[in-house]
C-alpha cells in the first residue's frame, strides 16, 4: 500500500498480508543473494549461517498472542527488521565493486528491495490493526514510542563475523515470515472470527 492509504476491506487486506508474507519467506529474495554477494556460498561457511535463538518470536509465541497482540508484535519486530536491513545495506559492496568482481548486480537490487517491501508489509499491518480497531499502534509515518530494542549482536569490527551475523539474521527473518504467514493463514473470513 502507498504511504498512509488503508483498505477498509478485511479480506482484501488479509489477502495482501498473506501474499506479502509468502514473498518474504522466500530465501531466493534475500538470504540467497546475500550469501552470494558476501562470498559465503561455500558449504563450510553455510554451516555457520544458523538462526540465532531468540532473535525472533517463535510461531508458538505468535499463535498465543491473539490478533491484536500478534499485530503489535509484528509491527515492532518489522521496525527493528528495517533497522537491521539498513545496517546490512550499509556494509554491502557498491554496485561498481560488484561489477568488477563479476558478481550479479541483480542480487544487490534484490537486497535493496527488501526494506521497501518490509515497509509495505508494515503499512498493511497497521491498516489491519486499524480495521480491528486497535488504536494502540503508531501510524507508520509518525514517530513511534521508540523501536523496541532487539537482541542486537554486539557491533563487531570483524568483517567476516559481521557477514555471518547478517546471514544468521536473514535466516531467522525468513523463518519468522514463514511463521507469520502460517498465523495469517488461520485467520477467518471476517475480522471477528478466527479459525484456531
Amino acid at each position: 500500500a502507498a504511504m498512509g492509504s488503508c483498505s477498509k476491506e478485511y479480506r482484501m487486506l488479509l489477502g495482501q498480508l498473506q501474499k506479502q508474507t509468502d514473498l518474504m519467506q522466500d530465501t531466493s529474495r534475500l538470504l540467497d543473494p546475500y550469501i552470494r554477494i558476501q562470498g559465503l556460498d561455500i558449504p563450510k561457511l553455510r554451516e555457520h549461517c544458523r538462526e540465532s535463538p531468540g532473535a525472533f518470536p517463535s510461531e508458538e509465541t505468535l499463535r498465543g498472542l491473539g490478533r491484536r497482540g500478534f499485530l503489535q508484535t509484528l509491527n515492532a519486530t518489522l521496525g527493528r527488521v528495517l533497522h537491521r536491513l539498513a545496517d546490512l545495506e550499509q556494509h554491502l559492496p557498491k554496485a561498481q565493486d560488484l561489477e568488477r568482481s563479476g558478481l550479479n548486480i541483480e542480487d544487490l537490487e534484490k537486497l535493496q528491495m527488501a526494506r521497501p517491501n518490509v515497509l509495505g508489509l508494515r503499512n498493511n499491518v497497521y491498516c489491519m490493526a486499524q480495521l480491528l480497531d486497535n488504536s494502540d499502534m503508531t501510524e507508520p509515518t509518525k514517530a513511534g514510542r521508540g523501536t523496541p530494542q532487539p537482541p542486537t549482536p554486539t557491533p563487531t569490527s570483524d568483517v567476516f563475523q559481521r557477514k555471518l551475523e547478517g546471514c544468521s539474521f536473514l535466516r531467522g527473518y525468513h523463518r519468522f515470515m514463514h511463521s507469520v504467514g502460517r498465523v495469517f493463514s488461520k485467520w477467518g473470513e471476517s475480522p471477528n472470527r478466527s479459525r484456531r
Partner: antibody
Framework: EVQLVESGGGLVQPGGSLRLSCAAS????????MSWVRQAPGKGLEWVAT????????YYLDNVRGRFTISRDNAKNSLYLQMNSLRAEDTAVYYC??????????????WGSGTLVTVSS | DIVMTQSPDSLAVSLGERATINCRAS??????????MHWYQQKPGQPPKVLIY???NLESGVPDRFSGSGSGTDFTLTISSLQAEDVAVYYC?????????FGGGTKVEIK
C-alpha cells in the same frame, strides 16, 4: 516549543578532535531517530550520520565512518557527534535534525540553527 | 551512492508567476509504492525547512502554493504563485538508501 540547540563548534587543527552536542526540548526525544547534517560555507547540504531512537543502530556517510561517532543520551535529551581525525574538508556548519516518517526512510522535520566547525592550521 | 541533480541552478521569476524546480536521481528512489523524495527551503542564515515529504505531501504549516510531484527518478517542486518570501535556495533530498543525498540546490529570485 520543539527546539534543537547545537553547541561545541569551534576552530580546530587538522587531525584534531571536537565533540558536538545537541540539546532537544519540546518533544519526546526518545521516540525519534536523530541526525547530523552539515553545510560547508557557501555550499549545499550533506547528510553525515543518523542514530536510531534507542541508539542501537547508527548510519554514517562513508567518508566520516571510522572518524565520527554519533551517540545519544535519552535521559538527558541529548545528541552527540564525536569528530576525530578532522580534515579541512570537514569545515562546515553542523546541524542537528529530527528524523520523522517511515523507519529508516526518514526525512528531517526539525532542525537546529547549527554550529560552525572550522578545521584549519 | 545516488546522485541528485537539480535544475536549474538558479531561477528568476516574477511575483505571482509559477516557479518549477526539477530533481533527477541517478537511480530510482521509488519502491513498493513509496517515493522517498523530499523538498526543503533554506533562507540565508537559517536552517533548512521541510516543504514537501514523500514527493507530494505538504508539510503542516506550509502554504499550499507549494506542491510536489514525480516518481522513480524525476521529481518536481512547483510554486504556483511566487511570493517575495519564497526567495531562498531549494533542495531535494532522497532517503531511499544510505547515504541520504541532497541535490545541489536551486536559488530562486524575483525577476
Amino acid at each position: 516549543e520543539v527546539q534543537l540547540v547545537e553547541s561545541g563548534g569551534g576552530l580546530v587543527q587538522p587531525g584534531g578532535s571536537l565533540r558536538l552536542s545537541c540539546a532537544a526540548s519540546g518533544f519526546t526525544f526518545s521516540n525519534y531517530a536523530m541526525s547530523w547534517v552539515r553545510q560547508a560555507p557557501g555550499k549545499g547540504l550533506e547528510w553525515v550520520a543518523t542514530i536510531s531512537d534507542g541508539g542501537s543502530f547508527t548510519y554514517y556517510l562513508d567518508n566520516v565512518r571510522g572518524r565520527f561517532t554519533i551517540s545519544r543520551d535519552n535521559a538527558k535529551n541529548s545528541l552527540y557527534l564525536q569528530m576525530n581525525s578532522l580534515r579541512a574538508e570537514d569545515t562546515a556548519v553542523y546541524y542537528c535534525a529530527r528524523d520523522v516518517g517511515h523507519t529508516t526512510f526518514w526525512y528531517f522535520d526539525v532542525w537546529g540553527s547549527g554550529t560552525l566547525v572550522t578545521v584549519s592550521s | 551512492d545516488i546522485v541528485m541533480t537539480q535544475s536549474p541552478d538558479s531561477l528568476a521569476v516574477s511575483l505571482g508567476e509559477r516557479a518549477t524546480i526539477n530533481c533527477r536521481a541517478s537511480k530510482s528512489v521509488s519502491a513498493a509504492g513509496y517515493n522517498f523524495m523530499h523538498w526543503y527551503q533554506q533562507k540565508p542564515g537559517q536552517p533548512p525547512k521541510v516543504l514537501i515529504y514523500y514527493a507530494s505531501n505538504l508539510e503542516s504549516g506550509v502554504p499550499d502554493r507549494f506542491s510536489g510531484s514525480g516518481s522513480g527518478t524525476d521529481f518536481t517542486l512547483t510554486i504556483s504563485s511566487l511570493q517575495a518570501e519564497d526567495v531562498a535556495v531549494y533542495y531535494c533530498l532522497h532517503s531511499r538508501e544510505f547515504p541520504f543525498t541532497f541535490g545541489g540546490g536551486t536559488k530562486v529570485e524575483i525577476k
